[in-house]
């Protein structure tokens, strides 16, 4: 399938609009600090060059790889050294090392200003004035803040973003129409970014085998009627797509994702009965729909797993002949029977099975040795079930905000060295598991909760990797992808932690808190809570509750005062002093 000119091939496959959008995303994900105008200029230059190659694939430089072309273009940026420091050293390398170097410098937490939403009329004017620039700016701002965002999916978000403005800027009440749509896109976008970040971490930190195992389990749950060979083909293709996107090969990734969607729709009879509606949609919607499609019904007459994987005398023979294929079949068979299990639980079971076979197939009596392997699964299954039951009860008792606070205290005590903004962000997201999953019936709770927690804990892992401060976080993040959540759950209070020096400035608040949204006000309070725990890790729940209740009352009182600033100054000093006394600081 070799093409004389890779850039011409991708331009023709994707079309000019998608080509330009994907190159912009790729550049913004690599050079996250560059101004919008600079990126647009680079994209236009690459696009003009691609067009010359479409016209004549033998033209000069058209035979170069996309990494060479894009890397050369990025390395023309004049301010590379002063803006990016050592990333400029990447430009001295040859491909493929140069691209690897750029990838290593992607920043999960770039020092960029928070995106502030302008007034609706201002946005609508900008949209009408120059729709193309407005949408490009959206791609640019999201891509540079989320350097692993799944690029073809970002095109889908941009399409919905455009549709929202097209509809709402003509509406009688523009704000009532537009703002809920933008909120939904923002929340879905953050979730999509975090899910993709886990896929990339899985590939980059744990390798292709780990990703393929995840994909086998998930696709077998989703398509339980599909044959193992069919699932294996989908897993291979999906792995290629995500390897490309995570590696910065966005044009190839988008092209291959489109091919995969086409294949799935052409073969839906042998894959799933749930794909019909998805397959009637246009390309971007179709790919998104397939990725989110509900699990198909399980075949009615599935035999017991024990026959092939425990009772058969050929277990060790089958395992020895093709270990990964046999384990893949085990995972496929187990997962298609258990849509009620999380993917990570299924992977733990498969790992336990593998470990048992490794040990037993070398024993004097293998069958006797592995006969009870399924009994070892019971505690592995019960652990997440019990954890979810307890936490859903706590969530129902406390509500989301106070449940988040309970998790903030729990995680700050486990890993107090982690930065306060990271602890707040991660604990708030962990706390959202309640509203997201606890409403589901038992059969859907575990896949919802534990797989969501895997995504959130990966955020902690990637943020911590940038500036490592805790050996315990490093250990839980790097030892086993599927055991991250149990590893964090098992952490107790860090007894080695030396409490932070008390700093009254951390607990000094001003009248500006009164104009914040409820969410931002919560974040301020939760930041204070983390700092309190860092000062007094042995504080009891009751002590912390007393301080937080008073803090809430203090903010409420001062926001109603005539002279708000004086109230915050005076009452704030008293609150600090009273809190110090109550906590014995």
């Amino acid at each position: 399938d070799a093409h004389k000119s890779e850039v011409a091939h991708r331009f023709k496959d994707l079309g000019e609009e998608n080509f330009k959008a994907l190159v912009l995303i790729a550049f913004a994900q690599y050079l996250q600090q560059c101004p919008f105008e600079d990126h647009v200029k680079l994209v236009n230059e690459v696009t003009e060059f691609a067009k010359t190659c479409v016209a004549d694939e033998s033209a000069e430089n058209c035979d170069k790889s996309l990494h060479t072309l894009f890397g050369d273009k990025l390395c023309t940026v004049a301010t590379l050294r002063e803006t990016y420091g050592e990333m400029a050293d990447c430009c001295a390398k040859q491909e493929p090392e140069r691209n690897e170097c750029f990838l290593q410098h992607k920043d999960d937490n770039p020092n960029l200003p928070r995106l502030v939403r302008p007034e609706v009329d201002v946005m609508c004017t900008a949209f009408h004035d120059n729709e193309e620039t407005f949408l490009k700016k959206y791609l640019y701002e999201i891509a540079r803040r989320h350097p692993y965002f799944y690029a073809p999916e970002l095109l889908f978000f941009a399409k919905r973003y455009k549709a929202a403005f097209t509809e709402c800027c003509q509406a009688a009440d523009k704000a009532a129409c537009l703002l809920p749509k933008l909120d939904e896109l923002r929340d879905e976008g953050k979730a999509s970014s975090a899910k993709q970040r886990l896929k990339c971490a899985s590939l980059q930190k744990f390798g292709e085998r780990a990703f393929k195992a995840w994909a086998v389990a998930r696709l077998s749950q989703r398509f339980p009627k599909a044959e193992f060979a069919e699932v294996s083909k989908l897993v291979t293709d999906l792995t290629k797509v995500h390897t490309e996107c995570c590696h910065g090969d966005l044009l190839e990734c988008a092209d291959d994702r489109a091919d995969l969607a086409k294949y799935i729709c052409e073969n839906q009879d042998s894959i799933s009965s749930k794909l019909k509606e998805c397959c009637e949609k246009p390309l971007l919607e179709k790919s998104h729909c397939i990725a989110e499609v509900e699990n198909d019904e399980m075949p009615a007459d599935l035999p017991s797993l024990a026959a092939d994987f425990v009772e058969s005398k050929d277990v060790c023979k089958n395992y020895a002949e093709a270990k990964d294929v046999f384990l893949g079949m085990f995972l496929y068979e187990y997962a298609r029977r258990h849509p009620d299990y999380s993917v990570v639980l299924l992977l733990r079971l498969a790992k336990t099975y593998e470990t048992t076979l490794e040990k037993c197939c070398a024993a004097a009596d293998p069958h006797e040795c592995y006969a009870k392997v399924f009994d070892e699964f019971k505690p592995l299954v019960e652990e997440p079930q019990n954890l979810i039951k307890q936490n859903c009860e706590l969530f129902e008792q406390l509500g989301e905000y106070k449940f988040q606070n309970a998790l903030l205290v729990r995680y700050t005590k486990k890993v107090p060295q982690v930065s306060t903004p990271t602890l707040v962000e991660v604990s708030r997201n962990l706390g959202k598991v309640g509203s997201k999953c606890c409403k589901h019936p038992e059969a859907k709770r575990m896949p919802c909760a534990e797989d969501y927690l895997s995504v959130v804990l990966n955020q902690l892992c990637v943020l911590h990797e940038k500036t490592p401060v805790s050996d315990r976080v490093t250990k839980c993040c790097t030892e086993s992808l599927v055991n991250r959540r149990p590893c964090f759950s098992a952490l107790e209070v860090d007894e080695t932690y030396v409490p932070k020096e008390f700093n009254a400035e951390t607990f000094t608040f001003h009248a500006d808190i009164c104009t914040l949204s409820e969410k931002e006000r919560q974040i301020k309070k939760q930041t204070a809570l983390v700092e309190l725990v860092k000062h007094k890790p042995k504080a009891t729940k009751e002590q912390l509750k007393a301080v937080m209740d008073d803090f809430a009352a203090f903010v409420e009182k001062c926001c109603k005062a005539d002279d708000k600033e004086t109230c915050f100054a005076e009452e704030g000093k008293k609150l600090v002093a009273a809190s110090q006394a109550a906590l014995g600081l």
Epitope: A546, V547, D550, F554, K574, A578, S579, Q580
Partner: nanobody
């Protein structure tokens, strides 16, 4: 209930010292804090120093290095030693006992006048 009575105020020349006392009747719990506030003519009341039952001290505003807060638990009394007084230290000094939750546990004395002449 807690009653607070301040004493020790008066007229004094700039550069001189005064010692204010605040005696509590009724019990302040171990998590309690006693603070001295002052209110200069035409200004808002401001907290200048606090001391907890456990002896934890905070100083605020422009009094650091000149004012010292201390307590005698046996006498249920908190003192504010004011040295190097300045005309801008003039005002009514109030004693305040408080602890969490503040909205329920906030007790005040009626104040003692301090006037510093230049």
């Amino acid at each position: 209930q807690v009653q607070l009575v301040e004493s020790g105020g008066g007229l004094v020349q700039a550069g001189k010292s005064l010692r204010l006392s605040c005696t509590a009747s009724g019990s302040i719990p171990s998590i309690g804090v006693t603070g001295w506030h002052r209110q200069a003519p035409g200004k808002q009341r401001e907290l200048v120093a606090t001391i907890s039952q456990g002896g934890h001290i905070n100083y605020f505003e422009s009094v650091k290095g000149r004012f010292t807060i201390s307590r005698d638990n046996a006498k249920n009394t908190v003192y504010l030693q004011m040295n190097s007084l300045k005309p801008e230290d003039t005002g009514v000094y109030y004693c305040n006992a408080f602890w969490l939750p503040l909205r329920l546990n906030d007790y005040w004395g009626q104040g003692t006048q301090v006037t510093v002449s230049s």
